[in-house]
Amino acid sequence: EEELQVIQPDKSVSVAAGESAILHCTVTSLIPVGPIQWFRGAGPARELIYNQKEGHFPRVTTVSESTKRENMDFSISISNITPADAGTYYCVKFRKGSPDTEFKSGAGTELSVRAKPSAPVVSGPAARATPQHTVSFTCESHGFSPRDITLKWFKNGNELSDFQTNVDPVGESVSYSIHSTAKVVLTREDVHSQVICEVAHVTLQGDPLRGTANLSETIRVPPTLEVTQQPVRAENQVNVTCQVRKFYPQRLQLTWLENGNVSRTETASTVTENKDGTYNWMSWLLVNVSAHRDDVKLTCQVEHDGQPAVSKSHDLKVSAHPKEQGSNTAAENTGSNERGSSDYKDDDDKHHHHHH
């Protein structure tokens, strides 16, 4: 009789995570009597995967009925494969004894696990940046195997080229992670823009995973200010407007100053949105010129998104309205020369208030 051989026909087997792996093993003889054991790895640190004689192996089932006579097929199926199961598996014949002793090993089957990368997570800078600045975005994806992976960056569908990518670890591992940093130059039109990180891997069957970041969370477009004097609305009143244009995000506080003194502070609420995603807002100041004997310097001061205030001033010539110079008004008596729309009862005045 020829000596027993342990045949593992597959040098390698590749399985998707979550599936079952079938590891084939046959022996060429019924002699010697003794059990089969499966190990992952070789040498003293090898890990027992299945022992025909004894033990509890909930994830392992035998492919054929090992109790049946003349059975020489000791293939096993391992359920719910994870990347941690990767390695070389050996089918080993033991000889009956006290204890059973190792008789012969198969050549081994290398199990590789195809694991999908996690959904890419794109994160931008902690603080907002303004147009013309370069900001960095990172993209991370984890848990994939094998190591080969492709990562691309896009801005509004246009592929970016300024990025650096690392796959870790460098050596052999059960699974891998990818980390990429892309540099993006912001423009004033980027409020509606998206940065996309796209990951392609053998497990995704040509349908890459994408992670996105909205530049609306990254960009700050500072406003432009324009202060103008409207025609006289009443004999003793001048309407001064401050147009705040093309800003983002909406968080904005406006303060009117008369000759450097705070006259009114308000927060942008009802704004108009431009096509590019930026906002416009307008504030009115009604100045009672009869309360002033000298020229008035009106300043529109805007604090946008917690940034240092920007301002625009306008000089109001009181001398242009001599009729009103000496008149007494309630405003003068109260020391107030500006009114918000809430101070007015008629719809026309409300309509001309700063909330548009």
């Epitope: 009789e1 019924l30 002699i31 009597v33 003794g34 059990p35 022992n51 025909q52 004689k53 004894e54 033990g55 009925e65 090992s66 109790t67 049946k68 006579r69 003349e70 059975n71 009956k96």
Partner: antibody
Framework: QVQLVQSGAEVKKPGASVKVSCKAS????????INWVRQAPGQGLEWIAM????????HYNQIFKDRATLTTDTSTSTAYMELRSLRSDDTAVYYC????????????WGRGTLVTVSS | DIVLTQSPDSLAVSLGERATINCRAS??????????IFWYQQKPGQPPKLLIY???NLDPGVPDRFSGSGSGTDFTLTISSLQAEDVAVYYC????????FGQGTKLEIK
């Protein structure tokens, strides 16, 4: 190591039934056949039947087919052999034996259970 | 059923001498290149012990003075140099079909 521990001696009257147990340890009970063999005093070995605990497949010696029933309890790794309609010539030592090579042989044996049938 | 017939029924051999026990099957016990014959030793008050499996393979732990041979229908158990502890009854068994035992051979010291 493999151990098969059998239940104690029984004395039965003719016509009665006996159920002998065999508790296995030291191996995975469902992976190997259990055989039952008997030996009358001063006589040779007589094979009764065998059972595969994994699926309760059984094979019986025709002589015992109508009177013997093999069962297993995998939760306790115990095999049972019940013999009905006992006669005096059923007096024997009843052995359970484990087949380690799936060759329908008997590699490891219990110590035996003496069943005496006497009126 | 396959019937196994052992010969002799009893045998007396001097210590250190060769002992030979035969087992003949009523039909071939070979299958797939294997001879499904097994030999057991039983000492008084003890269960049988497997000595030889598949006609010629020594069970682990069995002294190598025991050997088995034969094929088809005729098989032999040989003890090359009898020792005192070898006194026992020896049985052959087949499993080509459902198992049966030979009637046994009693081995004594001459």
């Amino acid at each position: 190591q493999v151990q098969l521990v059998q239940s104690g001696a029984e004395v039965k009257k003719p016509g009665a039934s006996v159920k002998v147990s065999c508790k296995a340890s030291g191996y995975t009970f469902t992976n190997y056949w259990i055989n039952w063999v008997r030996q009358a005093p001063g006589q040779g070995l007589e094979w009764i039947a065998m059972i595969d605990p994994s699926d309760s497949e059984t094979h019986y010696n025709q002589i015992f087919k109508d009177r013997a029933t093999l069962t297993t309890d995998t939760s306790t790794s115990t095999a049972y052999m019940e013999l009905r309609s006992l006669r005096s010539d059923d007096t024997a030592v009843y052995y359970c034996a484990m087949d380690y090579g799936s060759l329908y042989a008997m590699d490891y044996w219990g110590r035996g259970t003496l069943v005496t049938v006497s009126s | 059923d396959i019937v196994l017939t052992q010969s002799p029924d009893s045998l007396a051999v001097s210590l250190g001498e060769r002992a030979t026990i035969n087992c003949r099957a009523s039909k071939s016990v070979s299958s797939s290149g294997y001879n499904y014959i097994f030999w057991y030793q039983q000492k008084p008050g003890q269960p049988p012990k497997l000595l030889i499996y598949l006609a010629s393979n020594l069970d682990p732990g069995v002294p190598d003075r025991f050997s088995g041979s034969g094929s088809g229908t005729d098989f032999t158990l040989t003890i090359s140099s009898l020792q005192a502890e070898d006194v026992a009854v020896y049985y052959c068994q087949h499993s080509r079909e459902l198992p049966t035992f030979g009637q046994g051979t009693k081995l004594e010291i001459k």
